[in-house]
């Protein structure tokens, strides 16, 4: 879902709040990707984005082992990476970034969370000299309230994204449970 000819510019980080007093241990566990917005995300109505899940596991060195599970090509696909604590609690960078060809920077910022229900996380990366950003709306369950979805839409729009760059992935029966 990557339409990269004219990318919407990434917002200044001053427009992206940071969750105060971030509790890394409470953020652990499975999060469903209930909402997804970004400059390389495009809503496709005929074949909608399917929901995936991301599991955060805290390691002894306080970095996260991050595993996403997706349904792809009729099977479950696992994508594993490490998020290393950044300058302030709730900020992370990508571990072992040199092993990702073309990737020169990667920032993760937890915008807001109540840990047991929902979270919004901002991602920004530079790949092949192009700057990409996305925001995920995480839920501990596959469904979140309309109020949370509307807040996610408002926040995404405040970062310059139009509605066709904001999607709510469809919850599916395969891979993401269990």
């Amino acid at each position: 879902q990557d339409s990269t000819s004219d990318l919407i510019p990434a917002p200044p980080l001053s427009k992206v709040p940071l969750q105060q007093n971030f509790q890394d241990n409470q953020f652990q566990g499975k999060w469903y990707v209930v909402g997804l917005a970004g400059n390389a995300i495009l809503r496709e109505d005929k074949d909608p984005q399917k929901m995936y899940a991301t599991i955060y596991e805290l390691k002894e060195d306080k970095s996260y082992n991050v595993t996403s599970v997706l349904f792809r090509k009729k099977k479950c696909d696992y994508w594993i990476r490490t998020f290393v604590p950044g300058c302030q609690p709730g900020e992370f960078t990508l571990g072992n970034i040199k092993s990702y060809p073309g990737l020169t920077s990667y920032l993760v910022r937890v915008v807001s969370t109540n840990y047991n229900q929902h979270a919004m996380v901002f991602f920004k990366k530079v790949s092949q000299n192009r700057e990409y950003f996305k925001i995920t709306l995480y839920g501990r369950t596959k469904e979140l309230t309309s109020e949370l979805k509307e807040n996610f839409i408002r926040f995404s729009k405040s970062l310059g994204l139009p509605e066709n760059h904001i999607v709510f992935p469809v919850p599916i029966d395969q891979c993401i449970d269990g």
């Epitope: 109505d45 005929k46 074949d47 909608p48 399917k50 349904f71 009729k74 596959k142 469904e143 309230t145 309309s146 109020e147 979805k149 509307e150 469809v170 919850p171 599916i172 029966d173 395969q174």
Partner: antibody, heavy 116, light 107 residues
Framework: VQLQESGPDLVAPSQSLSITCTVS????????VHWVRQPPGKGLEWLIV???????TSNSALKSRLSISKDNSKSQVFLKVNSLQSDDTAIYYC???????????WGQGTSVTVSS | DIVMTQTPATLSVTPGDSVSLSCRAS??????LHWYQQRSHESPRLLIK???QSISGIPSRFSGSGSGTDFTLTINSVETEDFGMYFC?????????FGAGTKLELK
């Protein structure tokens, strides 16, 4: 674009129902197919959708009793409903997925009665 | 699940009348609301998507409005072929749910 359901008229309680939806004018590898039912004289109830990539989304209230599969080459989608009771008596429709999670083309429906 | 409530249950009209059908959601669904027509012994037909967006091939006398929890389908100058059931459907939250319908009948 056409969709056609086929299945039994009568099923005994506690038995299983199998219905086939045969489509033409579009490819199941490009479009999702929904199943919706309508009890006699009542409204519509959404059951399940088979997406083009083979993933499914189902109504959690019925999830344990529903199964769905498809054969892209034969342009057919198969719905199975287990442990039928009298309140499963309905017209069962298949419908093509359209943007914004609507259904733009519907089959004519197949009427199923659950009775001994 | 989101509950969709349609009013009135039955609407008796004369051809040429203009009518409004109401659909209310149990919580905000933004504009994720769609309308279908079902004539007697026929399959449902999509009339309006996303509260107010028209569908190709549907006569312009059908229009939709609303957002949040309250929605309206308006039929300007009802024709005899318009009689039947009208259902609203939400797609803001899974499972997809329909209203119980409004029956448009001849007075």
């Amino acid at each position: 674009v056409q969709l056609q359901e086929s299945g039994p008229d009568l099923v005994a309680p506690s038995q299983s129902l199998s219905i086939t939806c045969t489509v033409s004018g579009f490819s199941l590898s490009s479009y999702g197919v929904h199943w919706v039912r309508q009890p006699p004289g009542k409204g519509l109830e959404w059951l399940i959708v088979m997406w083009s990539d083979g993933s499914t989304t189902s109504n959690s209230a019925l999830k344990s009793r529903l199964s769905i599969s498809k054969d892209n080459s034969k342009s057919q989608v198969f719905l199975k409903v287990n442990s039928l009771q009298s309140d499963d008596t309905a017209i069962y429709y298949c419908a093509r997925h359209y943007g914004y999670f609507t259904m733009d083309y519907w089959g004519q429906g197949t009427s199923v009665t659950v009775s001994s | 699940d989101i509950v969709m409530t349609q009013t009135p249950a039955t609407l008796s009209v004369t051809p040429g009348d203009s009518v409004s059908l109401s659909c209310r959601a149990s919580q905000s669904i933004i504009t994720d609301l769609h309308w279908y027509q079902q004539r007697s012994h026929e399959s449902p037909r999509l009339l309006i998507k996303s509260a107010s967006q028209s569908i190709s091939g549907i006569p312009s006398r059908f229009s939709g409005s609303g957002s949040g929890t309250d929605f309206t389908l308006t039929i300007n100058s009802v024709e005899t072929e318009d009689f039947g059931m009208y259902f609203c459907q939400q797609s803001n939250s899974w499972p997809l749910t329909f209203g119980a319908g409004t029956k448009l009948e001849l007075k």
